[in-house]
């Protein structure tokens, strides 16, 4: 069966969106009237992996892009990346899991832990215009919450 | 009032390593993402590489990627620059800055002169 | 990676004179563009951000516009203090691109 995906956008708690930043990055920045057309819209795949309630396995890919977020490691850090796939081959129901994030829902807000690297979340920071990134730490400056937009198909 | 000091430049050998600091005072430091920036004899400016507040997310131009790795301690306000495998081509007057809106360089330092040379 | 172009690379001018510098970026940044002001010796001082914003404490002469690939520095009734070398810095995306620099000198 092929895997079930839905189109969404994400904005942090701070109601910044993610847009491009080149052509293998996203940032985050506040965003109003026309300029919300830049926002990225996301593709999200519900994936094969431990799943609870509140603890969904998704792939994050950009949509109508052969790009999804992945968590490597880099100069031995978790890294968040923007990684280039065959599109005749994803999205597919058992992906890598270095494609693979726990979507955590809390309090109405959503969480994006790395299946790759437990504890580590798709973060942002307080600051405009700065990149989003793979973080260590929750509850502390770097924003780890997010809420999700559906995007009709 | 905002200040920004750098130190740790000098001559060094080709190959050799040097750790530049930056001590911060006059704001909250750890609220801010860093900038390290230099500028080679008599040429123009050069970003190097940017850190955020938590130290999480870093970033580094590609003629320093894998040689020089940027770091901070919010407990003593002070930024850091690694630089290892120096070249002929890293000698610069290397500036620590603070970044302010949207990815400006709103305070720098005086600057510190990193020579690399036999 | 965005490549930053300044003009002129030097410009010969008088005490109340109008300038003008003109950066040009490879591809859009929108508004993510910072405009420094650098005297020998010393380190740069941020002038402009976000194309137009004058940073506080910087005399009104000094004025920034433009967005996309297009911006313009423009300084009315140069001042003795004015020469100096002026730069652009995009802040779109990493890794943060400066322009050549424009330098300034007295007629």
């Known amino acids: 069966a092929p895997v079930r995906s839905l189109n969404c956008t994400l904005r942090d708690s701070q109601q910044k969106s993610l847009v491009m930043s080149g052509p293998y990055e996203l940032k985050a920045l506040h965003l109003q009237g026309q300029d919300m057309e830049q926002q990225v819209v996301f593709s999200m795949s519900f994936v094969q992996g431990e799943e609870s309630n509140d603890k969904i396995p998704v792939a994050l890919g950009l949509k109508e892009k052969n790009l999804y977020l992945s968590c490597v490691l880099k100069d031995d850090k978790p890294t968040l990346q923007l990684e280039s796939v065959d599109p005749k081959n994803y999205p597919k129901k058992k992906m890598e899991k270095r494609f693979v994030f726990n979507k955590i829902e809390i309090n109405n807000k959503l969480e994006f832990e790395s299946a790759q690297f437990p504890n580590w979340y798709i973060s942002t920071s307080q600051a405009e215009n700065m990149p989003v990134f793979l973080g260590g730490t929750k509850g502390g400056q770097d924003i780890t919450d997010f809420t999700m937009q559906f995007v009709s198909s | 009032e905002v200040q920004l000091l750098e130190s740790g430049g000098g001559l060094v050998q080709p190959g050799g390593s040097l750790r530049l600091s930056c001590a911060a005072s006059g704001f909250t430091f750890s609220k801010y993402f860093m900038f390290w920036v230099r500028q080679a004899p008599g040429k123009g400016l050069e970003w190097v590489s940017v850190?955020?507040?938590?130290?999480?997310?870093?970033r580094y131009a590609d003629s320093v990627k894998g040689r020089f790795t940027i770091s901070r301690d919010n407990s003593k306000n002070t930024l850091y620059l690694q630089m290892n495998s120096l070249r002929a081509e890293d000698t610069a007057v290397y500036y620590c800055a603070r970044v302010g809106y949207g990815g400006n360089s709103d305070y720098w330092g005086q600057g510190t002169l990193v020579t690399v040379s036999s | 990676d965005i490549q930053m172009t300044q003009s002129p690379s030097s410009v010969s001018a008088s005490v109340g004179d109008r300038l003008t510098i003109i950066c040009r970026a490879s591809q859009d940044i929108n508004r993510w563009l910072a405009w420094y002001q650098q005297t020998p010796g010393n380190a740069p001082k941020l002038l402009i951000h976000s194309a137009t914003s004058l940073q506080s404490g910087v005399p009104s002469r000094f004025s920034g516009s433009g967005s996309g690939t297009d911006f313009t520095l423009t300084i009315n009734s140069l001042q003795p203090e004015d020469f100096a070398t002026y730069y652009c810095?995009?802040?779109?995306?990493?890794?943060?691109?400066f322009g050549g620099g424009t330098k300034v000198e007295i007629k």
């Open positions: 850190i955020s507040p938590s130290g999480h997310m870093t």
């Open positions: 810095q995009q802040a779109d995306s990493f890794p943060l691109t």
